[in-house]
């Protein structure tokens, strides 16, 4: 008998996204500076590179929780009935949404812990000391950059709230907790709060990006930074969710 | 059928305390400097203001878990019997203590994460660089302030331990976990450890306050800082708990 | 009826290890500098000393989860049968492995939170400012120490991954979660992932140690630093696990 049958697909998908993002980030953050200016940034691999991978995997998996629902709604609208069977792959996907969500939460928590560990690292300490030295040498009294401060205060705050909501979803997935809820309560948490956390995660990524969309330095070897790729699928899901939420389509779906 | 009936009261109370604390902190931290000296501190809202709200809500909700027990004991002492029905509002409150506790834990965890995120913020980095520059300008070899160091080491440590105990209470609230405990075990954890976490949270707040009680700068527009308001209810609960724990009263309650 | 009978042994062991490590660390970190050079480092007690105790307790308890399995296998190999009853103490120990594991996770989480709190402490801030001042005074442009950066990036990353795996073990210990798993799935997580987390924890400690093994300054009053003592038992367990995993012995055990 197979081990963890419902986890196969989510883990496979997560592993593929993680591997591709890792290689992509490695190329941009480590190999590019090595090739172009002989700068050795291998020390970035254990934390900084990994922590570009984690949010990418997390937000993609979370989008993949809500994408099949969107596809199912479109299929139903196209078929005009809910009695026609879904394709096998969609059926399988629909049944593993809980696992996708839990994996997403797992990666989000890891992302949070890695992020919180940034200022305790020696690399950060040494950089700080060098910045302080440079500030004194330049006789620059005030290091403050207002827009940069705003950017970080907002995206950190949104990230924490998004993670908190994701945690509620994870807790209500514990069998005995979900058993203590009515179906309506469980559905309310999983659908409403889930979309809210996807929305917060997406805004978190967009505010992290801030003005980097138009910063030519971000396009290393003509490749877009990871956050641009990361937000693509969540934005697609959110747009479709919003469209399906429009009164006209909503009525149609409820009729079906 | 209503969604989450047992959560209505705790969420309502939490929302009211959060809103009031938010507005109060906004007044003191943002509006006051803007009105009196045109200082724009809006950047404080997403993290610093929110993180004054979270512990206030958390410790108040935790106090509200143990306050009805105190009131019930006083009512029983007054009535001289345990067979007389409690007033409806007290009954309702008694039945939602678990929810109050879980919400308290939720806000405490958020408070911890927000606090841990402080040093990773750009605002903190820029301040550090400015402080370093100023220290060089002042030709000051040693920045160390002993009492300030002690204050923070103690309150951070107590905060973490308090949160850990609160986490144990939360875990034992998971239905299947509480089902695996005897009633005596469950009651021991919820009552004894609960009061310990309330005590630790209160001491955490008091040591955070340290010498700010007598610092005139803390009283913005004659308003006391949030920690003074925050510790009021927990201290009241702890005092009454201690009084009810006195042998003479304890015997009386056990007789009833 | 006794409270928490299965928790007595693990809590007793944890308390003993914690107390001894606390006293040992106090001697090395606080009493030694006081006695030899009148330096008052009492401020280290609430966080820095405690955070030497926590990982020591955590990794030891985790090793104690897998040590009885090793002893049991050796006993079986010695007896040549699995039908001979284990000694009472080993039996009792085998039955409390779950509690040892959960306690280990509890201490590991505490260790993580204490570690993450380091850079938010005033003591760290003041030290940073002093280092910056000294760097300017020495006119040292670059504070970077490559090997030190590498050491910390690796051990932090491994520590987080180890904690994440330990979290999976803890979650699957929730009754309703373990009930939803087949015996093979549960066993797979608890044995395979458990050993992986012990291995990661040990490597985390060894990389934390780095080149301190041969640093004479580490041997205060001829005593070895805590990490040397901490990794002893986990290494013993891992070596025995590896030996028992050798094809020849593995076949023998499976036959029994």
């Amino acid at each position: 008998q197979e081990l963890f049958p419902q986890w196969h697909l989510p883990i496979k998908i997560a592993a593929i996204i993680a591997s591709l993002t890792f290689l992509y980030t490695l190329l941009r953050e480590v190999i590019h500076p090595l090739a172009t200016s002989h700068q050795q940034y291998f020390y970035k691999i254990p934390i900084l590179v990994i922590n570009k991978v984690l949010p990418m995997v997390s937000i993609t998996l979370l989008a993949l929780v809500y994408l099949p629902g969107v596809i199912a709604a479109i299929v139903q609208l196209h078929n005009g009935t809910k009695y026609k069977k879904f394709p096998h792959w969609l059926d399988k996907w629909m049944l593993t949404r809980k696992q996708f969500g839990l994996l997403s939460f797992f990666f989000a928590v890891l992302h949070a812990i890695y992020s919180l560990s940034y200022p305790m690292r020696r690399s950060y300490r040494y950089k700080l000391l060098n910045w302080a030295y440079q500030q004194v040498q330049q006789n620059k009294e005030d290091a403050w950059i207002e827009h940069d401060v705003w950017r970080m205060e907002i995206y950190v705050s949104l990230g924490i709230v998004g993670l908190a909501i994701l945690a509620l979803l994870a807790v209500t997935s514990i069998p005995s907790v979900s058993d203590s809820l009515t179906w309506r309560e469980f559905h309310y948490i999983q659908s409403k709060l889930g979309i809210v956390s996807l929305l917060l995660g997406t805004i978190h990524a967009l505010i992290f990006a801030w003005n980097k969309w138009i910063d030519i330095k971000q396009f290393v070897w003509y490749t877009p930074p990871t956050f641009m790729i990361a937000v693509f699928l969540p934005i697609v899901v959110l747009i479709f969710k919003s469209i399906l939420f429009l009164p006209c389509l909503r009525k149609k779906i409820l009729k079906i | 059928q209503e969604l989450f009936p047992q959560w209505h009261l705790p969420i309502k109370i939490a929302a009211i305390i959060a809103s009031l604390t938010f507005l109060y902190t906004l007044l003191r931290e943002v509006i006051h400097p803007l009105a009196t000296s045109h200082q724009q501190y809006f950047y404080k809202i997403p993290i610093l203001v929110i993180n004054k709200v979270l512990p206030m809500v958390s410790i108040t909700l935790l106090a509200l878990v143990y306050l009805p027990g105190v009131i019930a004991a006083i009512v029983q002492l007054h009535n001289g019997t345990k067979y007389k029905k409690f007033p409806h509002w007290l009954d309702k409150w008694m039945l939602t203590r678990k929810q109050f506790g879980l919400l308290s834990f939720f806000f405490a965890v958020l408070h911890a994460i927000y606090s841990l995120s402080y040093p990773m913020r750009r605002s903190y980095r820029y301040k550090l660089l400015n402080w370093a520059y100023q220290q060089v300008q002042q030709n000051k070899e040693d920045a160390w302030i002993e009492h300030d160091v002690w204050r923070m080491e103690i309150y951070v440590s107590l905060g973490i331990v308090g949160l850990a105990i609160l986490a144990l209470l939360a875990v034992t609230s998971i239905p299947s976990v509480s089902d695996s405990l005897t009633w005596r075990e469950f009651h021991y954890i919820q009552s004894k450890l609960g009061i310990v976490s309330l005590l630790l949270g209160t001491i955490h707040a008091l040591i955070f306050a340290w010498n700010k009680w007598i610092d005139i700068k803390q009283f913005v527009w004659y308003t006391p800082p949030t920690f003074m308001i925050a510790v009021f209810l927990p201290i009241v609960v702890l005092i009454f708990k201690s009084i009810l724990f006195l042998p003479c009263l304890r015997k009386k309650i056990l007789k009833i | 009826q006794e409270l928490f009978p299965q928790w007595h042994l693990p809590i007793k062991i944890a308390a003993i290890i914690a107390s001894l490590t606390f006293l040992y660390t106090l001697l090395r970190e606080v009493i030694h500098p006081l006695a030899t050079s009148h330096q008052q480092y009492f401020y280290k007690i609430p966080i820095l000393v405690i955070n030497k105790v926590l990982p020591m307790v955590s990794i030891t308890l985790l090793a104690l989860v897998y040590l009885p399995g090793v002893i049991a296998a050796i006993v079986q190999l010695h007896n040549g049968t699995k039908y001979k009853k284990f000694p009472h103490w080993l039996d009792k120990w085998m039955l409390t492995r779950k509690q040892f594991g959960l306690l280990s996770f509890f201490f590991a989480v505490l260790h993580a939170i204490y570690s993450l709190s380091y850079p938010m402490r005033r003591s760290y801030r003041y030290k940073l400012l002093n280092w910056a001042y000294q760097q300017v005074q020495q006119n040292k442009e670059d504070a970077w120490i490559e090997h030190d950066v590498w050491r910390m990036e690796i051990y932090v990353s491994l520590g987080i991954v180890g904690l994440a795996i330990l979290a999976l073990l803890a979650v699957t210990s929730i009754p309703s979660v373990s009930d939803s798993l087949t015996w093979r799935e549960f066993h797979y997580i608890q044995s395979k992932l458990g050993i992986v987390s012990l291995l990661l924890g040990t490597i985390h400690a060894l990389i934390f140690a780095w080149n301190k093994w041969i640093d004479i300054k580490q041997f205060v009053w001829y005593t070895p630093p805590t990490f040397m003592i901490a990794v002893f038992l986990p290494i013993v367990v891992l070596i025995f696990k590896s030996i028992l995993f050798l094809p020849c012995l593995r076949k023998k055990i499976l036959k029994i």
């Epitope: 009294e141 005030d142 290091a143 403050w144 207002e146 | 400097p33 000296s37 045109h38 200082q39 724009q40 501190y41 605002s123 820029y126 301040k127 400015n130 402080w131 100023q134 300008q137 002042q138 030709n139 000051k140 070899e141 040693d142 | -």
Partner: antibody, heavy 124, light 113 residues
Framework: EVQLVESGGGLVQPGGSLRLSCAAS?????????WNWVRQAPGKGLEWMGY???????SYNPSLKSRFTISRDNSKNTLYLQMNSLRAEDTAVYYC?????????????????WGQGTLVTVSS | DIQMTQSPSSLSASVGDRVTITCKSS????????????LAWYQQKPGKAPKLLIY???TRESGVPSRFSGSGSGTDFTLTISSLQPEDFATYYC?????????FGQGTKVEIK
């Protein structure tokens, strides 16, 4: 009531030395304040000379070319300004002034209390 | 060093007049991190020590009459006496405490017309 009383001024020959004192009453010089020396040449503006913080660190005006040293005696609650290699252009009224000590929120503070000053005349 | 330039260097006014003194610094005195301008105004009467009137560009020292007000941000600052009183005839100095060395303006002497 905080009071700062300077003393030690007077006539001194060029190249000579002088030590000015500033006795503080009503406040400990080691508490939350830094202490400055400011001078004012006759009919001229104010010139900041240097300061000593509550922790004892000092900072000087670079234009004074290290001829001046600020120190303190905690037991006497007194600040000192040691002046060496005096020149005619050092003729001025010398004030000591108090400012709140540096902190990490507001950084620096203005000088809120001044002594009445002591006149130093450098002349042959 | 930060240069402080006051204008005018002297002015004549009558009791009850509104008097404005300006002070320019060679660089911004605003710390963006705490939104404070590190500029103070002092009043000095002949033979007396200077007295602090305004700090952080606009905050009145306790005991200073409300007719004295400070304004400005960055590099341009103003001290205003809304209604000049006989005791206000003195020399006024601005001072930056944004960094070291502390520097003063050359002073503005307010005389009786």
């Amino acid at each position: 009531e905080v009071q700062l009383v300077e003393s030690g001024g007077g006539l001194v020959q060029p190249g000579g030395s002088l030590r000015l004192s500033c006795a503080a009453s009503g406040y400990s010089i080691t508490s939350d304040y830094a202490w400055n020396w400011v001078r004012q040449a006759p009919g001229k503006g104010l010139e900041w000379m240097g300061y000593i913080s509550n922790s004892g660190s000092t900072s000087y005006n670079p234009s004074l070319k290290s001829r001046f040293t600020i120190s303190r005696d905690n037991s006497k609650n007194t600040l000192y300004l040691q002046m060496n290699s005096l020149r005619a252009e050092d003729t001025a009224v010398y004030y000591c002034a108090r400012e709140r000590n540096y902190d990490y929120d507001d950084y620096y503070y203005a000088m809120d209390y001044w002594g009445q000053g002591t006149l130093v005349t450098v002349s042959s | 060093d930060i240069q402080m330039t006051q204008s005018p260097s002297s002015l004549s006014a009558s009791v009850g007049d509104r008097v404005t003194i300006t002070c320019k610094s060679s660089q911004s005195l605003l710390y963006r991190s705490n939104q404070k301008n590190y500029l103070a105004w002092y009043q000095q009467k002949p033979g007396k020590a200077p007295k602090l009137l305004i700090y952080w560009a606009s905050t009145r020292e306790s005991g200073v009459p409300s007719r004295f007000s400070g304004s400005g941000s960055g590099t341009d600052f103003t001290l205003t006496i809304s209604s000049l009183q006989p005791e206000d005839f003195a020399t006024y100095y601005c001072q930056q405490y944004y960094n070291y060395p502390r520097t003063f303006g050359q002073g503005t002497k307010v005389e009786i017309k």
